[in-house]
């Protein structure tokens, strides 16, 4: 998955600050939106005559199967890496942005 190498193995929240975490999260969301748009464009170009193409289009109409699942994993990895999220102002409070995205799909 895109960005996976950037997220895997990050051992400690001190590797990034909260501010940098938000920026990285924003970059992930932006990449997800771009990829989503690319897939939607691909779907529009596919011919309905091909059963393989149409089944793929049906699968991909549920973005959770195609794209968001991948990015949600990345976001969840990122959240897990941070241990408790990035909020120092509200110690101990988890900011699960990834699950928030999942709820919104």
């Amino acid at each position: 998955a895109p960005f996976r190498s950037a997220l895997e193995g990050l051992p400690d929240p001190t590797a990034l600050s909260e501010k940098e975490g938000r920026l990285l999260l924003a970059a992930l969301v932006k990449a997800y939106v771009q990829r989503k748009n690319e897939l939607e464009q691909e779907q529009e170009q596919e011919t309905e005559g091909s059963s393989l193409d149409s089944s793929r289009a049906k699968r991909c109409s549920n973005l959770s199967t195609c794209v968001l699942g991948t990015y949600s994993k990345d976001l969840n990895n990122f959240h897990t890496f941070s241990g408790i999220g990035f909020g120092a102002e509200t110690p101990g409070k988890k900011r699960d942005i990834a699950s928030g995205l999942e709820r919104g799909r």
């Epitope: 001190t14 501010k19 940098e20 241990g83 120092a88």
Partner: antibody, heavy 112, light 112 residues
Framework: VEESGGRLVTPGTPLTLTCTVS????????INWVRQAPGKGLEWIAY?????GSSYASWAKGRFTISKTSTTVDLRITSPTTEDTATYFC???????????WGPGTLVTVSS | DPVLTQTPSSVSAALGGTVTINCQAS????????LSWYQQKPGQPPKLLIY???KLASGVPSRFSGSGSGTQFTLTISGVQCDDAATYYC??????????FGFGGGTEVVVK
């Protein structure tokens, strides 16, 4: 982690200390510089994140600059004074949930 | 930066006795528990004993323990050994648009 660049300098002469890391990547671990004056306690100086973001102790702003390459982290003492005489440690830490790695330190002596 | 006030500055302990060192932070630390304890002996870099306020670092004897949350923390050495004679430091971290760290002033432990 291993520090280098410590030496005797005269006040006002800029000095750059280098921390060379091996066995782990600066893309995954942040680095801090900490110093200890002879017979004194530990003082945190500066931090650099995996993305290159930096922060400084309030007393160190303007006096020090932290930067990094793929395998090294530099600490520049912009205009050393005698008060900067200390052993300077490069540290993978303090960290929240993993163990620290401290270098042996490099001695900086500022004297006229 | 977080200001960490460590007390006492020096303590004398009987062999087999108990030592308690306190550390007070000027503000709540990250997740209320970003507090580490270090042991330092002359000529050596600090050695991590406790992280996340109460977790024992690998290879550290169980006679060392840490407790506390928010701004008040304690290191306890139970059954003090001769080898425990050293200087002990607390260190804490906060994240407010960047990581900032601070060290306590140190506590010298003398074993009688």
């Amino acid at each position: 982690v291993e520090e280098s660049g410590g030496r005797l300098v005269t006040p006002g002469t800029p000095l750059t200390l280098t921390c060379t890391v091996s066995g782990f990547s600066l893309n995954r671990y942040a680095i801090n510089w900490v110093r200890q004056a002879p017979g004194k306690g530990l003082e945190w100086i500066a931090y650099i994140s995996i993305r290159g973001g930096s922060s400084y102790a309030s007393w160190a702003k303007g006096r020090f600059t932290i930067s990094k390459t793929s395998t090294t982290v530099d600490l520049r003492i912009t205009s050393p004074t005698t008060e900067d005489t200390a052993t300077y440690f490069c540290v993978r830490g303090p960290t929240y949930q993993i163990e620290d790695i401290w270098g042996p330190g490099t001695l900086v002596t500022v004297s006229s | 930066d977080p200001v960490l006030t460590q007390t006492p500055s020096s303590v004398s302990a009987a062999l087999g006795g108990t030592v308690t060192i306190n550390c007070q932070a000027s503000q709540s630390l990250y997740n209320n528990n970003f507090l580490s304890w270090y042991q330092q002996k002359p000529g050596q870099p600090p050695k991590l004993l406790i992280y996340q306020a109460s977790k024992l670092a690998s290879g550290v004897p169980s006679r060392f323990s840490g407790s506390g949350s928010g701004t008040q923390f304690t290191l306890t050495i139970s059954g003090v050994q001769c080898d425990d004679a050293a200087t002990y430091y607390c260190a804490g971290g906060i994240d407010i648009d960047g990581w900032y760290f601070g060290f306590g002033g140190g506590t010298e432990v003398v074993v009688k």
